[in-house]
């Protein structure tokens, strides 16, 4: 089944987001975190910035790397746009040492790399050729990872962008892929990372670097270009071959990634992003990958997760594919069932190989090298955990993913996925035992622009998500617990970062709140039965005249709940001409008569684990009166009438606690009743806590509080 809609949608201005933007600078696509320095490095178009990771609006350093007019002109002569393409887009931003970064930019289609000194925050002026490390074209895909001072990258090697390459930039042993269709076939590079053999780095030579990309299928023939998601792997200890595969990878192997739901025929074959989850509680790293289908006219996205051992098994024990015989070009590639040379082609030079006297890839026999040159593709595919996607979401195109593993109050660990969209939003989804719960959606960027980069800062007690777009970078906390104003709402959020503290009557963030968590309430199944202390409730009292129309407000944040209106404890339906609903929340009562006087309750009903949780959101006491005209007193305030309809308005600032609100006057538009500004909390404690008594030509306010024992 498709994942449900996010339970809560936070609009851009509704929650505390911090933004960094430098006027005139665009394409904030490269993000790098220095946890020990609490610094976020941002690579943008023609600039690199250092900002305070705890408050990114605080810029620490900046350096500009602009293209000379001469270079711009030469680039334009080759048919490229002087205004957009012939600029310097920072595409590689990698740590080189504790005091320097390795930075590469497209540099008007002449990719160039340099070292950025972090002390002076100036480039050293090395101007290294960036070919094979950084794309020529800012529109082309790229990925890179720095491993032991050597840059491993996947990009295009030439101006036309027609020559893909996975390379290692190294002074003593540079390596690259063969420029051959079976090795890389029009790939779109997505992600690269190193997986260390041992956490302490003692067996560094046995480390492996994994590349994720989507490429055009070589193994299947279709009328259209069939795209295939891949994972490829190279060994850090690879030194190339002596004659065959000289200065080329001898360990390059690639395999297909499966992400599909066979029962529905849904195949997700376009890889968008990958995140490697490493956590103390995990016995091995897990690759989380975001996919979309190739023909995505409906806006579908999926997340599949793969264990390292599953990936590694395909490369170390799987069968190979071979190019089909000459005259069967339509069959393309088929499984190779012949003898496999020893040592195994594509295998790393590990302790076992060294014991057999193969101390380096330079010692490998020609048979092994020729085999891997001709058979880079595995026949076995990499299957996801549980053989199905963790999440399938409709009506959304996910662009990036980061995953955090967090411990809930009961000690259980949960994987929380943060997924950015092509419309500037961030979805937070928690993987529960039998389902995925999409906790919330936060609109990070006002202009609904695609999120280009996503980064998770996982420093204990100071966790943030950083998102880069064309216009800037946004910093968001991992949870907005404080926005849940009641215990029920805090628990129903099913957010592992949040718990209700009865002591301070607030929803607090776990691992960040001071003091003991004793007595806190959290239930990842959404069971609110532990929520005993009912918060103070208020009611709204209204006086209306006969024949008029009343609008009773109700604020509901949960997208998973339905609003139910009750009158004298009976549910109201909008089928009769008597009632109408505004935005499925607010109640309209037409042609008021004496029989409409009484208590109206707005409740939210939310289905959680086959149970319905009901909460009172608002209570209105309505009295329909035949009112004689009262001349306004000097102290009273006038409320405008709209024909026979009187619209009561509420102040913007909702008053918390027991102090009564300040009276306020609201003018009504002659055409329509304007809704009050969105409540900034999830509104389950019946905000605003006030009473509005409305009489024609007379407007007064007083606050009445109910305790949970009062009539509901």
């Amino acid at each position: 089944a498709f994942a449900p809609v996010p339970r809560i949608t936070w609009e851009h201005g509704e929650v505390g987001l911090v933004k960094f933007h430098e006027p005139g600078i665009f394409n904030y696509s490269s993000l790098l975190m220095s946890e020990d320095k609490d610094t976020l490095y941002v690579g943008a178009r023609e600039a690199v910035f250092a900002v305070n990771a705890l408050d990114i609006s605080e810029k620490q350093h900046e350096v500009y790397w602009k293209v000379s007019e001469d270079k711009k002109s030469k680039c334009a002569e080759k048919g490229k746009s002087k205004q957009t393409e012939c600029l310097n887009y920072i595409r590689v931003l990698q740590p080189l040492s504790s005091t320097s970064l390795y930075v590469c930019g497209t540099n008007a289609f002449q990719p160039t790399c340099d070292h950025l000194n972090l002390t002076s925050f100036k480039f050293l002026g090395k101007s290294e050729d960036g070919k094979g490390r950084c794309p020529f074209d800012p529109a082309h895909s790229y990925t890179s990872v720095m491993v032991g001072g050597e840059l491993y990258s996947g990009t295009s090697y030439n101006f036309l962008g027609s020559e893909p390459i996975i390379s290692r930039n190294s002074s003593h042993s540079p390596l690259r892929t063969e420029y051959a269709i079976p090795w890389l076939n029009e790939p779109s590079f997505v992600f690269a990372d190193v997986i260390h053999k041992s956490p302490d780095g003692t067996e560094a030579e046995d480390d492996k670097v994994y590349f994720f990309f989507t490429e055009v299928s070589v193994e299947y023939e279709f009328v259209f270009k069939l795209m295939i998601p891949r994972v490829a792997r190279v060994c850090k200890g690879d030194q190339g071959g002596l004659r065959t595969l000289q200065k080329k990878w001898t360990s390059f192997l690639k395999a297909r990634l499966i992400c599909s739901r066979p029962d529905s025929g849904l195949v997700f074959n376009i890889l968008q992003d990958v995140f490697v989850l490493r956590a103390p509680g995990l016995k091995e790293p897990v690759f989380y990958a975001v996919f979309t289908p190739q023909l995505n006219n409906v806006g579908l996205s999926a997340v599949c997760a793969y264990t390292l051992s599953t990936v590694e098994a395909v490369f170390s024990r799987g069968k190979y594919m071979q190019s089909a015989t000459v005259e069967q070009s339509h069959t393309k590639w088929v499984r190779y069932n012949g003898p496999v040379p020893t040592p195994r082609p594509g295998a790393c030079i590990d302790s076992e190989a060294r014991a057999a006297n193969y101390t380096s890839s330079l010692n490998l026999p020609d048979k092994t090298l020729q085999f891997v040159k001709d058979h880079p593709l595995m026949d076995d595919s990499v299957t996801p955990i549980d053989n199905r996607p963790k999440l399938i979401k409709k009506d959304v195109n996910y662009t990036q993913i980061v995953v955090d593993r967090t411990q809930a109050l009961d000690g259980t660990f949960y994987d929380v996925m943060f997924l950015s969209t092509d419309r500037g939003a961030l979805h937070k989804a928690v993987i529960l035992a039998k389902e995925v719960h999409v906790v919330e959606e936060t609109q990070l960027f006002q202009d609904f622009e695609p999120v280009l980069s996503l980064l998770l800062s996982s420093k204990k007690g100071r966790k943030f998500v950083y998102a880069g777009s064309n216009s800037g970078v946004v910093q968001a906390p991992l949870a907005f617990c404080g926005k849940h104003s009641s215990c029920e709402d805090c628990v129903l959020a099913r957010d592992p970062y949040c718990a209700w503290s009865p002591a301070i009557k607030a929803c607090v963030t776990l691992h960040q709140a001071e003091g003991s968590s004793r007595g806190w309430i959290q239930d990842m199944s959404g069971d609110t039965s532990s929520c005993l202390d009912k918060s103070k409730e208020s009611f709204h009292q209204h006086f209306f005249k006969h024949g008029g129309t009343a609008e009773l407000k109700c604020f509901q944040k949960s997208n998973l709940a339905r609003v139910v209106w009750k009158f004298q404890n009976g549910e109201l339906k909008a089928v009769s001409p008597k009632y109408g609903f505004v935005g499925r929340k607010h109640l309209l009562i037409f042609n008021l008569s004496d029989g409409d006087s009484g208590v109206y309750q707005c409740l939210s009903e939310e289905r959680v684990r086959n149970k319905t949780v009901s909460q009172l959101l608002a209570k209105h006491i309505l009295e329909v009166k035949m009112v004689a005209r009262i001349p306004p007193s000097p102290t009273s305030q006038t409320a405008q009438t709209e024909g026979s309809r009187i619209t009561s308005k509420m102040p913007v600032a909702s008053t918390q606690g027991s102090s009564p609100p300040t009276p306020a006057l609201w003018a009504t538009s002659p055409r329509a009743a304007t809704l009050p500004p969105k409540s900034s909390s999830t509104g389950t404690s019946c905000e605003p806590k006030m009473v509005i008594n409305t009489v024609p030509q007379l407007h007064s306010e007083k606050t009445v509080y109910l305790k949970s024992s009062d009539n509901r």
Partner: antibody
Framework: QVQLVQSGAEVKKPGSSVKVSCKAS????????MHWVRQAPGQGLEWMGQ????????SYNQKFKGKATITVDKSTSTAYMELSSLRSEDTAVYYC???????????WGQGTTVTVSS | DIVMTQSPDSLAVSLGERATINCKAS??????????MNWYQQKPGQPPKLLIY???NLESGVPDRFSGSGSGTDFTLTISSLQAEDVAVYYC?????????FGQGTKLEIK
């Protein structure tokens, strides 16, 4: 053995178009890029462009953009190059060549002479 | 574009003697220690034939009297002992950067 066989010589009028073919045999056509090189009478060699037979993705020397269109038919293991708006200066021998792993043209077609004359 | 300049334009060498053809690139054709320079032989009415790839690697089936050397911008094709069948035009070609470019050719004749 590995072979590239090109279509026969063509005589064309200025302003017209011509389509030269290059049929591959003896190897897996989809596994190697196919390139086109031209040689004007008494002149040197000029690289025109290339195609990926698997995807049909072509890229061109800026000089020949709009002049040449490279395509493939995988079912017959044939690459094509069409030249449009022919002028007398397009008179040349056109070669197809297989681009091998080591980044070189290891197998060449015999060449197709295109003569543009009114 | 990388401009390839061959020298000399034509060369006459006695049978059994050494023939040397030079090729200079307007910028380096090396990448990470590899030189993407190839040499071709073309006889009248025939397509070019690959002799040397990656600056110094002899194509299979090519006599070992042919050799290539050089890196960066300067390359040399050497025929250690000229044979009658070596009379042809020789081209250098770089494949490091598109558009791939050829030298103007060197015509080799027997003196």
């Amino acid at each position: 053995q590995v072979q590239l066989v090109q279509s026969g010589a063509e005589v064309k009028k200025p302003g017209s178009s011509v389509k030269v073919s290059c049929k591959a045999s003896g190897y897996s056509f989809s596994d190697y890029y196919m390139h086109w090189v031209r040689q004007a009478p008494g002149q040197g060699l000029e690289w025109m462009g290339q195609i990926n037979p698997t995807t049909g993705g072509a890229s061109y020397n800026q000089k020949f953009k709009g002049k040449a269109t490279i395509t493939v038919d995988k079912s017959t293991s044939t690459a094509y190059m069409e030249l449009s708006s022919l002028r007398s200066e397009d008179t040349a021998v056109y070669y197809c060549a297989r681009y091998y792993y080591g980044r070189h043209f290891d197998v060449w077609g015999q060449g197709t002479t295109v003569t543009v004359s009114s | 574009d990388i401009v390839m300049t061959q020298s000399p334009d034509s060369l006459a060498v006695s049978l059994g003697e050494r023939a040397t053809i030079n090729c200079k690139a307007s910028q380096s054709v090396d990448y990470d220690g590899d030189s993407y320079m190839n040499w071709y032989q073309q006889k009248p009415g025939q397509p070019p034939k690959l002799l040397i790839y990656a600056a110094s690697n002899l194509e299979s089936g090519v006599p070992d009297r042919f050799s290539g050397s050089g890196s960066g911008t300067d390359f040399t094709l050497t025929i250690s002992s000229l044979q009658a069948e070596d009379v042809a035009v020789y081209y250098c070609q770089q494949s490091n950067e598109d558009p791939y470019t050829f030298g103007q050719g060197t015509k080799l004749e027997i003196k």
